[in-house]
Interface confidence: low
């Protein structure tokens, strides 16, 4: 969490941002809140990005003002206009690109004063893994697949019964480049699976960590997946 305070002759207002991660090809949110003002027409929101000359987005007098917007953001940004009045200056970024990563500044002017806060935005690709029993294999084998990751993640297998065991010798992981030549499909196979055990396939890079669990018994297979974004710090 980053909390910024305004400076200069005018009173300062508190602006708060939260570091976040964007999934390339999807829409992302750059979070920013501020002390609200009574009058929408008195609020100016400017989003800037370090190293970019034009603005990322500007909202003033109750509407978008995009005449100074940098070309790399044209047609891809929006604020939540109906929430500005309650102090939400968050920016929606459409079709997140790898190059959107960097340091952003949320700069606010209201009748109460000015304030700003920086936000670190990471970009990559992350997706839920799915673990299945691979019936094609000669022996009982588990197959963990996740369609989109970038940068290349690490894959670690774990089991409930054999806690702390190293499965690297009995697993094989491959990365297949997807058609857009950036993200990769992750496939990891675990051999010598025993029944009455729960196995976890953990995929992690510096953007996200995802886990796919599978419980294997003689009578049934139960699956569960979850994904967690890393380094979501508020400013």
């Amino acid at each position: 969490l980053i909390i910024g305070f305004g400076i200069s002759g005018r009173h300062s207002i508190t602006v708060t941002t939260v570091a976040s991660a964007g999934n390339i090809g999807e829409d992302g949110i750059l979070s920013c809140t501020f002390e609200p003002d009574i009058k929408l027409s008195d609020i100016v929101i400017q989003w800037l990005k370090e190293g970019v000359l034009g603005l990322v987005h500007e909202f003033k007098e109750g509407k978008d003002e995009l005449s100074e917007q940098d070309e790399m953001f044209r047609g891809r940004t929006a604020v939540f206009a109906d929430q500005v009045i309650v102090g939400n200056a968050s920016l929606r970024l459409k079709n997140v690109q790898l190059t959107d990563a960097g340091t952003y500044k949320c700069y606010i002017i209201t009748s109460k004063g000015k304030g700003n806060a920086n936000l670190e935005y990471k970009t990559g690709a992350f997706s839920m893994p799915e673990v299945n029993v691979d019936y094609n294999a000669s022996s009982e084998t588990l197959r963990c697949e996740a369609p989109r990751w970038f940068p290349q993640p690490t894959v670690v297998w774990a089991s409930q019964v054999d806690q702390g065991a190293n499965f690297s010798e009995v697993s094989n992981t491959s990365f297949e480049l997807n058609s857009e030549n950036v993200t990769m499909k992750v496939v990891s196979v675990l051999y010598n699976v025993t029944i009455n055990n729960t196995y976890s396939c953990m995929i992690e890079n510096d953007i996200a960590k995802a886990t796919g669990d599978i419980k294997v018994t003689e009578s049934e297979i139960k699956r569960r997946s979850h994904l967690q974004l890393l380094n979501s710090k508020a400013s």
Epitope: G51, V52, L53, G54, D64, L66, S67, E68, Q69, D70, E71, M72, R74, G75, R76
Partner: antibody
Framework: EVQLVESGGGLVQPGGSLRLSCATS????????MSWVRQAPGKGLELLGF??????????EYSASVKGRFTMSRDNSKNSLYLQMNSLKTEDTAVYYC???????????WGQGTTVTVSS | EIVLTQSPDFQSVTPKEKVTITCRAS?????MHWYQQKPDQSPKPWIY???NLASGVPSRFSGSGSGTDYTLTINSLEAEDAATYYC???????????FGGGTKVEIK
């Protein structure tokens, strides 16, 4: 003072080639998008394409009318913009201008233009 | 690709008269820019971001509009305003600058 000066125009036969240059001064060249615009005799302005700035990787976009025949390039060490024109047609006869994007999506400075005549 | 249609193509106007030039976009755009061009001269930026006058442009000029319809207005025409005016906008999909066909303003 910002200046843009085009050169390299002249008379060329259909199917021929020509290279136009745009020498610039008075601003940090690598920070700006640069464009080529032409104007056929008695006609309106037509954008041929543009080349982005350093922050946007110097990538290029071309209009459909010249894509595959014309190539834009820039030499940031010389503060210069170029337009290589191949397979020229009589309809390419025009005054060719280079222009700077102001960061506000419009052209704030233009060169004086250089005339290209394609005729046999 | 967005197409800009200017009207009228030609306007013959007496001095001190009000002139209105319109530019219609084939789909909604966020702002419009205008240029003035005189014979044998390069175009000059005249109005940017819909309503902002470029440096040195007389205050009798103004710009307005939103969505698909934009207007350049000369409040009281003077002889030096005889020129061709072009509208221009930026489209991000595909990324390209587009010009209108131009409106020639002549003094009667």
């Amino acid at each position: 003072e910002v200046q843009l000066v085009e050169s390299g125009g002249g008379l060329v036969q259909p199917g021929g080639s020509l290279r136009l240059s745009c020498a610039t001064s008075g601003f940090t060249f690598s920070d700006y998008y640069m464009s080529w615009v032409r104007q056929a005799p008695g006609k309106g302005l037509e954008l041929l394409g543009f080349i982005r700035n350093k922050a946007n990787g110097y990538t290029r976009e071309y209009s459909a009318s010249v894509k595959g025949r014309f190539t834009m390039s820039r030499d940031n060490s010389k503060n210069s913009l170029y337009l290589q024109m191949n397979s020229l047609k009589t309809e390419d006869t025009a005054v060719y201008y280079c222009a700077r994007d102001s960061h506000r999506t419009y052209f704030d400075y233009w060169g004086q233009g250089t005339t290209v005549t394609v005729s046999s | 690709e967005i197409v800009l249609t200017q009207s009228p193509d030609f306007q013959s106007v007496t001095p001190k008269e009000k002139v209105t030039i319109t530019c219609r976009a084939s789909s909604s755009v966020s702002s419009m820019h205008w240029y003035q061009q005189k014979p044998d001269q390069s175009p000059k930026p005249w109005i940017y971001a819909t309503s902002n006058l470029a440096s040195g442009v007389p205050s009798r000029f103004s710009g307005s509009g939103s969505g698909t319809d934009y207007t350049l207005t000369i409040n009281s025409l003077e002889a030096e305003d005889a020129a061709t005016y072009y509208c221009q906008q930026w489209s991000s999909n595909p990324p390209m600058y587009t010009f209108g066909g131009g409106t020639k303003v002549e003094i009667k």
